[in-house]
């Protein structure tokens, strides 16, 4: 994500338009407490980070409260007074939406509608992945709102589902992060299950009259 300057690699994650995490990997300064200085306006004075991330006892990143700052982050990573990496970035291009909340399932015969609370901002995709023990890989369906209907399911099979949110690439670009997945939930015959058997259970023999 960040171009190397004096061997410094950076990563930016903007968590749900609320918190910005900037981390660095600087092999040349691996045993040094680098400091992080930032501002949200090009002509303001820099503030110093007050919430450092540590790795093996040394600073490796900074967490910033940036709720709805809708802006450019100007920052400088320094060794003492010497800047080792200075840059500025639109924060939105590093968006990581929050994980879906209040996920609900509504069954109707061979179809299920998965809903959750839409996030407060747009241009997102809500992706549902699902599989049964008979499937070799996850199937996927996504929509612009958290209202995803999956049809053609087999009512007798057990299905695992999970949901995540992604930023639309056309709008936010290729450097965003999908949200974490919601918890896996398992369903069979329209009822929630603790788990789906890893191996498909053989069909029960029909009882003779």
């Amino acid at each position: 994500q960040g171009g190397a300057a004096e061997g410094v690699q950076i990563q930016i994650i903007y968590f749900n338009l609320e918190t910005v995490q900037v981390t660095w990997n600087a092999s040349k300064y691996s045993r040094t407490n680098l400091t992080f200085h930032y501002r949200f306006n090009g002509d303001e004075a820099y503030d110093q980070c007050t919430n450092y991330l540590l790795q093996e006892g040394h600073t490796s990143g900074c967490l910033l409260d940036a709720e709805q700052r809708d802006d450019i982050l100007y920052f400088s990573i320094r060794n003492g007074t010497h800047p080792v990496f200075t840059a500025s970035r639109w924060m939105v291009y590093y968006l990581k939406p929050s994980s879906p909340k209040h996920v609900r399932f509504s069954w109707h015969q061979d179809a299920v509608t998965v809903t959750c609370s839409d996030l407060s901002y747009g241009d997102l995709l809500y992706e549902v992945q699902y599989r049964s023990p008979f499937d070799t890989e996850w199937q996927s369906k996504q929509e612009n709102t958290c209202n995803v209907t999956i049809e053609g399911l087999d009512a007798e099979k057990c299905y695992s589902f999970w949901v995540r949110v992604k930023a639309m690439e056309d709008v936010y670009g290729p450097d965003t992060y999908p949200s974490d997945w919601s918890e896996v939930t398992c369903w069979q015959r329209g009822e929630i299950r603790d788990a789906c058997a890893e191996t498909p259970t053989p069909p029960k023999p029909k009882l003779s009259k």
């Epitope: 171009g3 450019i72 639109w90 939105v92 291009y93 407060s120 747009g122 056309d170 670009g173 290729p174």
Partner: antibody
């Protein structure tokens, strides 16, 4: 359709002030940010900063603080650029432009799909 | 600042020619690059964004490519109405534009 209509050309003396307006139509004004850009005669384009039409929060690019003020009147879907203490080097065409993709809830991102027609400000004694 | 350098600064080509304009960023901007077309007396028009995505209503003879620091705008078959100044613009951070390429018909 989306339109940005700017006020007409201005001729001002050095030291005076000017206020350029940019009236938006065809969309919900507070949904997308407005940037201001300038183009000096025969020169390239320079981004001056932007204003969040939802919060009213202005952000100025380096070199455009002090004499330059962005403001809004959301009741008439209009953004304003005011320049004070005008200098000869402020002579330029000033454009307003709407952020094309990112909504004001999220912010701005520096891509300009919709532009005003431009306002020529001439500063001459 | 991220400096954007375009080349050539002007070029003359014949109708039907394939035309290429290049743009170089002073640092890695990934694919955060747009191309604009500006005709005399008009505001710029967005042609390309994300280095290669065509804007709405932009003819498919216009294409963009590149990532990192080196980018290209190509007009596959030049038409008379393509006479204009073309600008590249980065939006990795606060926007900066190239100095422009003036395209004329021979």
């Amino acid at each position: 359709q989306v339109q940005l209509v700017q006020s007409g050309a201005e001729v001002k003396k050095p030291g005076a002030s000017v206020k350029v307006s940019c009236k938006a139509s065809g969309y919900t004004f507070t949904t997308y940010g407005i940037s201001w850009l300038r183009q000096a005669p025969g020169q390239g384009l320079e981004w001056m900063g932007w204003v969040n039409t939802n919060t009213g929060n202005p952000r100025y690019a380096q070199g455009f603080t002090g004499r330059f003020v962005f403001s809004l009147d959301t009741s008439v879907s209009t953004a304003y650029l005011q320049i004070s203490s005008l200098k000869a080097e402020d002579t330029a065409v000033y454009y307003c432009a709407r952020e094309g993709f990112i909504t004001t809830v999220v912010g701005a991102a520096g891509r300009f799909v919709y532009w005003g027609q431009g306002t020529l400000v001439t500063v001459s004694s | 600042d991220i400096q954007m350098t375009q080349s050539p600064s002007s070029l003359s080509a014949s109708v039907g020619d394939r035309v290429t304009i290049t743009c170089r960023a002073s640092q890695d901007i990934h694919t955060r690059l747009a191309w604009y077309q500006q005709k005399p007396g008009q505001p710029p028009k967005l042609l390309i964004y994300w280095a290669s995505t065509r804007g709405s209503g932009v003819p498919d003879r216009f294409s963009g490519s590149g990532s990192g620091t080196d980018f290209t705008l190509t007009i596959s078959s030049l038409r008379a109405e393509d006479v204009a100044v073309y600008y590249c613009q980065q939006y990795s951070t606060y926007p900066t534009f190239g100095q422009g390429t003036k395209l004329e018909i021979k």
